[in-house]
Amino acid sequence: IVLRPSRVHNSEENTMRALTLKDILNGTFSYKTFFPNWISGQEYLHQSADNNIVLYNIETGQSYTILSNRTMKSVNASNYGLSPDRQFVYLESDYSKLWRYSYTATYYIYDLSNGEFVRGNELPRPIQYLCWSPVGSKLAYVYQNNIYLKQRPGDPPFQITFNGRENKIFNGIPDWVYEEEMLATKYALWWSPNGKFLAYAEFNDTDIPVIAYSYYGDEQYPRTINIPYPKAGAKNPVVRIFIIDTTYPAYVGPQEVPVPAMIASSDYYFSWLTWVTDERVCLQWLKRVQNVSVLSICDFREDWQTWDCPKTQEHIEESRTGWAGGFFVSTPVFSYDAISYYKIFSDKDGYKHIHYIKDTVENAIQITSGKWEAINIFRVTQDSLFYSSNEFEEYPGRRNIYRISIGSYPPSKKCVTCHLRKERCQYYTASFSDYAKYYALVCYGPGIPISTLHDGRTDQEIKILEENKELENALKNIQLPKEEIKKLEVDEITLWYKMILPPQFDRSKKYPLLIQVYGGPCSQSVRSVFAVNWISYLASKEGMVIALVDGRGTAFQGDKLLYAVYRKLGVYEVEDQITAVRKFIEMGFIDEKRIAIWGWSYGGYVSSLALASGTGLFKCGIAVAPVSSWEYYASVYTERFMGLPTKDDNLEHYKNSTVMARAEYFRNVDYLLIHGTADDNVHFQNSAQIAKALVNAQVDFQAMWYSDQNHGLSGLSTNHLYTHMTHFLKQCFSLSD
């Protein structure tokens, strides 16, 4: 029997409770989104709550189950994929995570026409990647680093590549650095629009130095994980792109697509591939010194049976103030003439905007303009272009969806989302059906997320797909912190910040301040999104003020801010956090003796440097999986922003910007250093070197390692991590447990 005290006052205050750490760790207040799996202009698939795969037809309003949960369960399927001719479904099970995007799995093919699994010529296991052709039911898959093709699921496979070798040659899948820092996918193969051709990348890692670390497991001897991982300045993967005719794959075999001359003359990267038509493909290349990108449009020469990339179809994008693009070089969205395209790149004022390229980049027609940025082009149809930007009301941390009518002249612009649910929804993404007949809008906040379905012609809302009613009800008796997004103007720099305030915040009182920082190039922390997370709990229950600040190097506010950190990482990002803290102190409600900073990954680097800045502002801080020297991090990422660690390039700043160089300055702060020993991304080496430098300097500090955990510190480690950090902060701020 649980005795509850009777409510004396029926006031909201009494019925409400603060967030607990348990709420956060249990994911009690997590939200759902609804992204339709579009299969035509008016149909989509969705996995129902009871795990049936249901096909919805928007126009008829009908829905039916195409695959029962019973069939899914029979092979323990966690994912599925319908073939475009709707005759087969692949079922994915035995999911085994590798890196950020990559995983292996077992695949079963289910024949919808006879309700049976395809027997004979079954797929090998485990498969590294599998996908249907865009038309029909051809299958391409990667097994043991080689690519295979099936004309039909029951057919014997045709082996396309033969040189695949673990950690040496990767066909159709990226190696570690391409997966994490360039493609951001688990695959490196692309079907042409009608499935005639299959393009794929081959990565040769033969000469790349290997990172090796122990995986302790449960055995008597730990095993060693070896990953070809190019650190800054090291030998990089060698990439080649091939295309094979999938109708007659044995006829001429894979044909290599040439690299543009100005790219091939020195080390380079392949950055993306976009099919335009079945016989026209667009490849993007990038010099190793990443300020020059070349977009090359290549055509299939029937008479030659090869791919021709004329000089006239090479388009160069060059940055004179930083690196090419934002985080990545943007990809083109082709128009219906199959040669002109829309692309986001910096305009003359240094803001990323949509441009229309018909012949040369020099003659590009600017489609959007202003002191804000176009962020993503979702879809181009015959008469409309849909994109997202942060233009509305001049808040860089918002995302609204716009439609530009390109069929009429002059083109007219309409904000589709700006006034839909103005208070609740200021940060949107979208998902479009074929020909943009319909689209789903997914709103991430600042209110409770909501997903809705819309008519692509009229923009009319058709229905709510997910509104998180249960979450809304669950939060009714929770004292959530207050959030505000504002800006500071300092020395011609605008510093946007988000402040998370305790529920009963009183400006006349003094509160401990925690800075949460990421601060990496082209990142954005100050966003109008909903979140109930660890910092929400710290504000709600522990009475802390938490602030997030977007300083120099962050995105979507123009190139001046973005490229300010070019070739000098670890300087301005730290300065701007410090500047913001000083401004917060001036506001009068911060207890300046109780200020902390914490961050993860790049944020761990920034928090470490801030703690070691010698300002005396911070009492304590936490670095989770920090970078400690840019010489230890991946070439593709690091060199984009820092150049090469060579004497004639930028070695001096590589050396000056390490955490270790500032070991002495940690003497007067409480520092908690945390890292997973099996971090494939930011290697444990980084924290090992910080610890060594602190020991050598005889500086006391606290540390926690997580055995066999990667950069994400997932599972039970998450609970331990946040509990541990909470204790550390409460001790630092003299808060009772």
């Epitope: 040439p258 690299v259 543009p260 001359a261 100005m262 091939a264 003359s265 020059v292 020469r301 030659w304 090869t306 990339c309 004329p310 000089k311 006239t312 090479e314 388009h315 160069i316 060059e318 040369t360 980049v361």
Partner: antibody, heavy 119, light 109 residues
Framework: DVQLVESGGGVVRPGESLRLSCAAS????????MGWVRQAPGEGLEWVSG????????YYADSVKGRFTISRDSSNNTLYLQMNSLRAEDTALYYC????????????WGLGTLVTVSS | EIVLTQSPGTLSLSPGERATLSCRAS??????LAWYQQKPGQAPRLLIY???DRATAIPDRFSGSGSGTEFTLTISRLEPEDFAVYYC???????????FGGGTKVEIK
Amino acid sequence: DVQLVESGGGVVRPGESLRLSCAASGFTFSSYDMGWVRQAPGEGLEWVSGIRVSGGSTYYADSVKGRFTISRDSSNNTLYLQMNSLRAEDTALYYCAKENDRHSFFEYWGLGTLVTVSS
Amino acid sequence: EIVLTQSPGTLSLSPGERATLSCRASQSVGYYLAWYQQKPGQAPRLLIYDASDRATAIPDRFSGSGSGTEFTLTISRLEPEDFAVYYCQQYYNNWPPLTFGGGTKVEIK
């Protein structure tokens, strides 16, 4: 009609410099990649250098790398070849040539200008 | 660097005869090969590009064939004005260095 007229050739001593010019007319100079090809007396053709429209990329044969510099001035439709540290083996008839817009073969050639390097 | 070898060095033929000139590449150049004609005291003139496409105003007695590493220029019936030196040039993927063959001299027998 496409016309390419080279000038600037002459007799120089080893180690000296020379600047060749090529005046182009009859086509949109700024839209085409250009190159220099040379022919030593009684010998075959040797590609020397090329310059791209896009990005202004420049390319050189190994035999002249670091000594020769190709450039262009689209305002007066002129291609240049700055030749420093000249050697006896640079003695040749130097042709200015217009590349095809799609591929790097030479559609039109000038009549050439003779460079003689002799002590 | 891709090396082009032309053969024969000299071809002695009479007007009206068929001339077959060969150009061999040290590695595959696909179809990226051009042929030029050069007469004494004159600049080279483009005859064939992309291995087999005739340039503007080139008579159809000139034809090119081949791909990869083996290429042929054929002059079906030699005219008096065809006696000259012929050069092949590769421009594989438009990559420098562009290279020329050593030339074949077609002379009157």
